[in-house]
Interface confidence: medium
């Protein structure tokens, strides 16, 4: 399976208190079960919606409602494939103080996608 984080550069800088949406694209697998990892630990969240682009191309989301300092770190997504864990390239999430200008790359996902989420 080919995994990649979409719509995000290697370094993602956001203002404290702002929402962040990370997209993970999985190709070459049917019905992948995507897990998100932060700094080496699985993010203990119920999964986000998966968008089936095609039978073997899926996109999953990780959404943070209101980013705080504790959310800063290195994120990646992973899937189990044939008993092995495959991981994506990571993205570094860094914060700037509330009100500072930041590059909101997390808005790059397609605006028509409405996805369930419970994190601000």
């Amino acid at each position: 399976a080919g995994l990649k984080l979409m719509g995000a550069p290697v370094k993602l800088t956001v203002s404290q208190g702002q929402p962040v949406k990370l997209n993970c694209s999985v190709e070459g697998m049917e019905e992948p079960d995507i897990q998100w990892v932060k700094d080496g630990a699985v993010v203990q969240n119920l999964d986000q919606l998966y968008i089936p682009v095609s039978e073997q191309h899926w996109i999953g989301f990780l959404s943070l409602k209101s980013v705080e300092r504790s959310d800063a770190g290195r994120y990646w997504c992973q899937v189990e494939d044939g008993g092995e864990t495959e991981i994506s390239q990571p993205v570094w999430l860094t914060l700037v103080p509330r009100g500072s200008s930041a590059h909101h790359h997390h808005h790059h996902h397609h605006s028509a996608w409405s996805h369930p989420q419970f994190e601000k």
């Epitope: 019905e31 992948p32 079960d33 993010v43 203990q44 969240n45 119920l46 999964d47 998966y50 089936p52 943070l64 409602k65 209101s66 705080e68 189990e80 369930p116 989420q117 419970f118 994190e119 601000k120």
Partner: antibody, heavy 116, light 108 residues
Framework: EVQLVQSGADVKKPGASLTISCQAS????????ISWVRQKPGKGLEWMGS????????HYGPSFQGHVTISADRSTATAYLQWRSLEASDTAMYYC?????????WGPGTLVTVSS | SYELTQPPSVSVSPGQTARITCSGD??????AYWYQQKSGQAPVLVIY???KRSSGIPERFSGSSSGTMATLTISGAQVEDEADYYC???????????FGGGTKLTVL
């Protein structure tokens, strides 16, 4: 049309085992999670737990962990809620629901009565 | 375990504004969802992600969230809005979901 068809009402004695089912139709079963919600007579809604769209993982509410088991059979698009040993306090209406946050499609509910 | 706290009941006259609150320690970080349940029926999603109205829900229903409090507002409540309303959100860790205790809205 998206539909969730639940098994019929059941009456059991305390200590008995029980499995109720929820068959999905009108959509691709593996595209969505399935959640179970309990509602005791005259009381509020309680989230019991959910099973992932690939049926590989389950999440349970603290009150239900260890008391019920959620499973699914992808080949028949059916989700299950199972008890090994029922208690009188399990008397309730049990809804299966498509999703886990956006609970848009609800089954009609299965009434489970546990009485000696 | 995590709890969401709602008032047991709210009463308004037809045409008045009804506000139903939901309090929870994780709400600054977690989205709130609101469900309406009329007598003898399955619940219906009214508001998702704090403030987005579900399809088919009248414009008089709106939602907001600030700090540890989420609020469902019904501007110009109608008799047909009489129902039980439940907030729904995730715990702090995000590994399970919780319903509030429910609020019975009476419009008379």
């Amino acid at each position: 049309e998206v539909q969730l068809v639940q098994s019929g009402a059941d009456v059991k004695k305390p200590g008995a085992s029980l499995t109720i089912s929820c068959q999905a139709s009108g959509y691709t079963f593996t595209d969505y999670w399935i959640s179970w919600v309990r509602q005791k007579p005259g009381k509020g809604l309680e989230w019991m737990g959910s099973i992932t769209r690939s049926s590989s993982r389950t999440h349970y509410g603290p009150s239900f962990q260890g008391h019920v088991t959620i499973s699914a059979d992808r080949s028949t698009a059916t989700a299950y809620l199972q008890w090994r040993s029922l208690e009188a306090s399990d008397t309730a209406m049990y809804y299966c629901v498509r999703g886990y946050t956006h609970l848009r499609t609800w089954g009609p509910g299965t009434l489970v009565t546990v009485s000696s | 375990s995590y709890e969401l706290t709602q008032p047991p009941s709210v009463s308004v006259s037809p045409g008045q504004t009804a506000r139903i609150t939901c309090s929870g320690d994780a709400l600054p970080k977690k989205y709130a969802y609101w469900y309406q349940q009329k007598s003898g029926q399955a619940p219906v999603l009214v508001i998702y992600e704090d403030s987005k109205r579900s399809s088919g829900i009248p414009e008089r229903f709106s939602g907001s969230s600030s700090g540890t409090m989420a609020t469902l507002t019904i501007s110009g409540a109608q008799v047909e809005d009489e129902a039980d309303y439940y907030c729904y959100s995730a715990n702090q860790r995000g590994n399970y979901m919780v319903f509030g205790g429910g609020t019975k809205l009476t419009v008379l």
